[in-house]
């Protein structure tokens, strides 16, 4: 068997809305995968698994299940979003992010995904990591690949 | 329905402790936070802090920082509340609170039926 | 900390009439989300305090019509149209926006 390659193209769009009384915020980030067969016979994805972590606490978790088939050598794109919220411990958070006086409220996550590949009953798992920029201050739609992170600080807690 | 019990009077002395009850019912305990106030005799209200009974999570007012203790069983859906180094400034009826509502319109919606504590040598 | 002002500790009414009871804070309560967090609750002698008002103007389940909450930003107004018997007691304003959440005083309602 050839390989199946998963890339991780980057956020595709964050929603966000606030709770003002338990200062919370809530994410909706969706992201993008290209899944590549390299195969010249069909597989499944089987399941898409993903969480998001900001300041290396989990805010989200996701599981898509019975995604789509790939054909051979074939590439298909597949969105997934992950529902996130920044509260509590992290309720700091919501001070920047509503903060008027800046236009860009950019916060560093790391996503992670995993996904589950299979083909004559063999069961195959490819996971990726990414740090992405995220603006939690109003909903944003991303060009693709225009979130990744680079080397900057995190806001400071 | 909805109820909030709470323990019975407690009688204490200076420097001693208490640990106040808030039992739960008619509604799903980990879906909403659950707030303290107490009242002094005669007095206004104070709000003392909350516990998030699904994380355990709490938030004190600073006034109450080294005075309570707020935690939370979700199998028994009771609330708890250790008041510790009791002076006489501590003698109150102490009310739990439910915060129901939804994101951005919360407010509390049920009281318990309130535990008097009084503090005396 | 938000500090809540009940400046009258009583008011005394007649059953029948109508009374306004007011609250002042020291910061606006009105969010950008054009929500304004001040809420007023009943406390009946000898009982748990009960929510009246939440929102400035939204009356709580179960609450007769009698009651209505109105208000700015810093002032707010709890009126009690054709005043019964039942409605003595002391009447808490509190904001809800900002940690500490905190009440007012108190203005304690009594039938003449």
């Known amino acids: 068997p050839r390989s199946i390659d998963v890339k991780y193209i980057g956020v595709k769009s964050a929603y966000v809305s606030y709770d003002v009384q338990k200062r919370t915020i809530y994410l909706n980030i969706t992201n993008t995968l290209n899944i590549t067969n390299n195969n010249y016979y069909s597989v499944e994805v089987e399941n898409i698994t993903a969480q998001v972590q900001f300041a290396k606490t989990v805010i989200g978790k996701a599981r898509l299940n019975n995604i789509t088939h790939i054909g051979p050598l074939d590439m298909k794109q597949i969105d997934y979003t992950v529902p996130t919220v920044i509260a509590e411990e992290m309720s700091y958070m919501y001070d920047f992010c509503t903060l008027i006086s800046i236009k860009v409220h950019n916060i560093v996550l790391m996503m992670q995904v995993t996904v589950t590949t299979t083909y004559f009953g063999h069961s195959e798992q490819i996971s990726q990591e990414r740090y992405q920029y995220v603006d939690c201050g109003r909903n944003t739609t991303y060009q693709l690949g225009q979130s990744e992170y680079l080397n900057v600080l995190q806001p400071q807690q | 329905q909805v109820q909030l019990q709470q323990s019975g009077a407690e009688l204490a002395k200076p420097g001693a402790s208490v640990k106040l009850s808030c039992k739960a019912s008619g509604y799903t305990f980990i879906s909403y936070w659950m707030h303290w106030v107490k009242q002094r005799p005669g007095q206004g209200l104070e709000w003392i802090g909350y516990v998030n009974p699904s994380s355990g999570y709490t938030k004190n007012n600073q006034k109450f920082k080294d005075k309570a203790t707020l935690t939370a069983d979700k199998s028994s859906s009771t609330a708890y509340m250790q008041l510790s180094s009791l002076t006489y400034e501590d003698s109150a009826v102490y009310y739990c609170?439910?915060?129901?509502?939804?994101?951005?319109?919360?407010?509390?919606?049920?009281w318990g039926t309130g535990t008097t504590v009084t503090v005396s040598s | 900390d938000i500090v809540m002002t009940q400046a009258a500790p009583s008011v005394p009414v007649t059953p029948g009439e109508s009374v306004s009871i007011s609250c002042r804070s020291s910061?606006?309560?009105?969010?950008?989300?054009?929500?304004?967090?001040s809420y007023w609750f009943l406390q009946r002698p000898g009982q748990s305090p009960q929510l009246l008002i939440y929102r400035m103007s939204n009356l709580a389940s179960g609450v007769p019509d009698r009651f209505s909450g109105s208000g700015s930003g810093t002032a707010f107004t709890l009126r009690i149209s054709r005043v019964e018997a039942e409605d003595v007691g002391v009447y808490y304003c509190m904001q809800h926006l900002e940690y500490p959440y905190t009440f007012g005083g108190g203005t304690k309602l009594e039938i003449k």
């Open positions: 609170a439910r915060e129901g509502g939804s994101i951005s319109d919360w407010y509390f919606d049920v």
């Open positions: 910061k606006s309560l009105l969010h950008s989300n054009g929500n304004t967090y």
